[in-house]
């Protein structure tokens, strides 16, 4: 190929071509979570199943150890849902006993640790006040944005608290990521 | 230029390029719900506008009859909002009555229908308690992930209960699907 | 039809290929907000962080004065999170006095302002009733679909109260859009 | 009630075409795929093709490519398929059955045959 | 198009015996489904998606593999389990069903 085919003349060439189906990609999706040690201050990141039912990964994005890690630098879409469900926040309760109310939230975050890079850098975070009525609640927080990656960068999702939530349903917590 | 020189040796092509331009898209906006008949322990799928307003479906992505029809196998990033509204919920009524508080709920589900599987697979599910204060409360659920997808498979969005979906706006209400 | 109408004579390019590197693409994130006058009945637009920490725009996507300034025509996804907070709305208490109960709302429009048509055009829009118990709430709201757009459009976030945003961190509150 | 109700026994010469019938009741054929399939005289099952209502699309057994046509009505809910240039050894019953939806459902069956 | 092959062609077997038979299928498929079939009737779904047992289907059946190898057990033969039992795939176009296993009493 001489690379002249399709190239229209007001269209310099400033990057290799590729064929959309080589790019990395990945969605995982949501498995029952072990207990792990982690430290205080610091949310617990989540495992996920990467290869069974509608979960994947392709074109050298791997799973490993509740990270995907970037094969090549780019710009990647990246997003997560996650799905909470709890009894009745102590909320309305302390309100009427007269207390501070200070309400209880959920909150997820998709990390990335990079080399280049001595912190942990939190790409995206949604966190929610939970102050329910009733005395079963669920709900999702969905988060999804562009950045730009580096080759070997790891990314994770972070939750407050592993215990609230919803590993049932592979269609209702779930972590993925595409090269643009 | 010859085109070579930005073709690293690591980066055969595994697929054929593509015009992004000729990629199948579709982006379905809300329209007025016909009620029509749907089958106990299945929640309804909404009907949408493919072609007014900010709606659109191109490069052999149709809409027919509810479904977006997938024309060609690959990876497809899929998105759904649906903004619902309602009433109080009977919760705090409830809650105050002393019976078993049983929040209600407002459930979105993107669902693929595919002839390689027998039954439908729910891809993506938003589901909230919806256990409100106010007289009138409203709220969008947002999904999106990425999946891969056969030709001459369909996907809709079904919802828990059609008439809570504010239809009012092709803002509020949509749903899409382009190949990556 | 016997079956062939998906075969893959579709592999014939119909548009220049392009490499997916020089597509314009920008991230934009949170900023403390500088009051600005703005006109009744209409929503006030946020500005935006473009090129420090996760912020950048490349490939002639430009932002100036709030606005993304789109550089080529053709399909974009374009997205944004707005995390809100405040004190707790007067909801519950306006419903104990016996007076109306409208409650409280919180919206985010992504709004496109084009050359070719005379008034702005609403893209997507997220609105939540806030009818809160507990003193201090926060919570995101998450927005993103495919659009297309002109050479020349301007994209904006429009917030329906610019004092409940929360500028805090650039992981909370984003807005961005990539040619796809 | 989730069913498939099959048109009656045909008896055709060879050479001749068939249009066989299968009326949906209890779900939207559209939300769903129909096939076709046969069963010759002691003989295993033999799948044809199948038609998304919806829209109309087929897919085929390619050794029936040149003969077989499927299509749909929506407003009747009804499937038919056709097959055309009959021979002997097209005797057989012919079952519709859906997918895309559980329960997985089957017709009763349409005995034809194929005789000089 | 990839073959399915079911083996044992025929089975003779008591009341209260322990099933098992084979389907195995030229290339890899995703999942396999099970169909029964009783004389003069219409196939009945059986297994949908390797393991999931239909509607009404008594737990006494499983079903197993991956890849293509393929397994249909029955712990328990009762007398109405006497049947043809036909495998499928449906990852590959056409459609394929094996040949079938004939269930007899003994």
């Known amino acids: 190929l001489k690379g002249q085919e399709f190239a229209p003349s007001h269209q310099q060439v400033y990057a290799p071509l590729r064929a959309d189906g080589d790019k990395p990609r990945a969605h995982l999706t949501v498995v029952r979570q072990t207990p792990t040690q982690h430290f205080k201050n610091q949310f617990p990141a989540l495992h996920w199943e990467h290869e069974l039912g509608l979960a994947f990964t392709k074109n050298r994005m791997n799973y490993t150890n509740k990270f995907l890690l970037i094969p090549e630098s780019g710009d990647y879409f990246i997003y997560s849902q996650v799905t909470f469900r709890g009894m009745t926040s102590e909320c309305s309760e302390i309100r009427q006993a007269g207390r501070p109310n200070k309400p209880d939230s959920i909150t997820v975050v998709i990390t990335k640790v990079t080399d280049s890079y001595p912190e942990p850098t939190q790409l995206l975070m949604g966190t929610k006040s939970v102050c329910e009525v009733g005395s079963n609640w669920f709900q999702p927080i969905y988060l999804g944005a562009m950045f730009s990656l580096q080759e070997g960068d790891k990314l994770m999702v972070n939750v407050s608290d592993i215990s609230l939530v919803d590993y049932t349903k592979e269609d209702k917590t779930f972590f993925g990521a595409f090269l643009l | 230029l010859k085109g070579q020189e930005f073709a690293p040796s690591h980066q055969q092509v595994y697929a054929p390029l593509r015009a992004d331009g000729d990629k199948p898209r579709a982006h379905l906006t809300v329209v007025r719900q016909t009620p029509t008949q749907h089958f106990k322990n299945q929640f309804p799928a909404l009907h949408w506008e493919h072609e007014l307003g900010l709606a659109f479906t191109k490069n052999r992505m149709n809409y027919t009859n509810k479904f977006l029809l997938i024309p060609e196998s690959g990876d497809y990033f899929i998105y759904s909002q649906v903004t619902f509204r309602g009433m109080t919920s009977e919760c705090s009524e409830i809650r105050q009555a002393g019976r078993p508080n049983k929040p209600d709920s407002i459930t979105v589900v993107i669902t693929k229908v595919t002839d390689s599987y027998p039954e439908p697979t729910q891809l993506l599910m938003g589901t909230k308690s919806v256990c409100e204060v106010g007289s009138n409360w409203f709220q969008p659920i947002y999904l999106g992930a990425m999946f891969s997808l056969q030709e001459g498979d369909k996907l809709m969005v079904n919802v828990s209960d059609i008439s809570l979906v504010d239809y009012t706006k092709e803002d509020k209400t949509f749903f899409g699907a382009f190949l990556l | 039809l016997k079956g062939q109408e998906f075969a893959p004579s579709h592999q014939q390019v119909y548009a220049p290929l392009r490499a997916d590197g020089d597509k314009p693409r920008a991230h934009l994130t949170v900023v403390r907000q500088t009051p600005t006058q703005h006109f009744k009945n209409q929503f006030p637009a946020l500005h935006w962080e473009h090129e420090l920490g996760l912020a950048f725009t490349k490939n002639r996507m430009n932002y100036t004065n709030k606005f993304l300034l789109i550089p080529e025509s053709g399909d974009y996804f374009i997205y944004s999170q707005v995390t809100f907070r405040g004190m707790t709305s007067e909801c519950s208490e306006i419903r104990q006095a016996g007076r109306p109960n409208k409650p409280d709302s919180i919206t985010v429009v992504i709004t496109k302002v084009t050359d070719s048509y005379p008034e702005p055009t609403q893209l997507l829009m997220g609105t939540k009733s806030v009818c809160e118990v507990g003193s201090n709430w926060f919570q995101p709201i998450y927005l993103g679909a495919m659009f297309s757009l002109q050479e020349g459009d301007k994209l904006m976030v429009n917030v329906s109260d610019i004092s409940l945003v929360d500028y805090t961190k650039e992981d909370k509150t984003f807005f961005g859009a990539f040619l796809l | 009630q989730v069913q498939l109700v099959q048109s009656g026994a045909e008896v055709k010469k060879p050479g001749a075409s068939v249009k066989l019938s299968c009326k949906a009741s209890?779900?939207?054929?559209?939300?769903?795929?129909m096939h076709w399939v046969r069963q010759a005289p002691g003989q295993g099952l033999e799948w044809m093709g199948r038609?998304?209502?919806?829209?109309?699309?087929?897919k085929y057994d390619p050794k029936f490519q040149v003969r077989v046509t499927m299509t749909t009505d929506t407003s009747t809910s009804t499937v038919y398929m056709e097959l055309s240039s009959l021979r002997s050894e097209d005797t057989a019953v012919y079952y519709c059955?859906?997918?895309?939806?559980?329960?997985?459902?089957w017709g009763q069956g349409t005995t034809v045959t194929v005789s000089s | 198009e990839i073959v399915l092959t079911q083996s044992p062609g025929t089975l003779s077997l008591s009341p209260g015996e322990r099933v098992t038979m084979s389907c195995r299928a030229s290339?890899?498929?995703?999942?396999m489904y099970w169909y029964q079939q009783k004389p003069g009737q219409a196939p009945r779904p059986w297994i949908y998606?390797?393991?999931n047992l239909a509607s009404g289907v008594p737990d006494r059946f499983s079903g197993s593999g991956s890849g293509t190898d393929y397994t249909l057990t029955i712990s328990r033969l009762e007398p109405e389990d006497f049947a043809v039992y036909y495998c499928?795939?449906?990852?590959?176009?056409?459609?394929?069903f094996g040949g079938g296993t004939k269930l007899e009493i003994k």
């Open positions: 059955s859906r997918s895309g939806g559980l329960p997985d459902v």
């Open positions: 209890g779900f939207d054929i559209q939300d769903t795929y």
């Open positions: 038609i998304d209502p919806a829209s109309g699309h087929t």
């Open positions: 290339s890899s498929v995703s999942y």
């Open positions: 998606a390797t393991s």
């Open positions: 499928q795939q449906w990852s590959g176009n056409p459609r394929t």
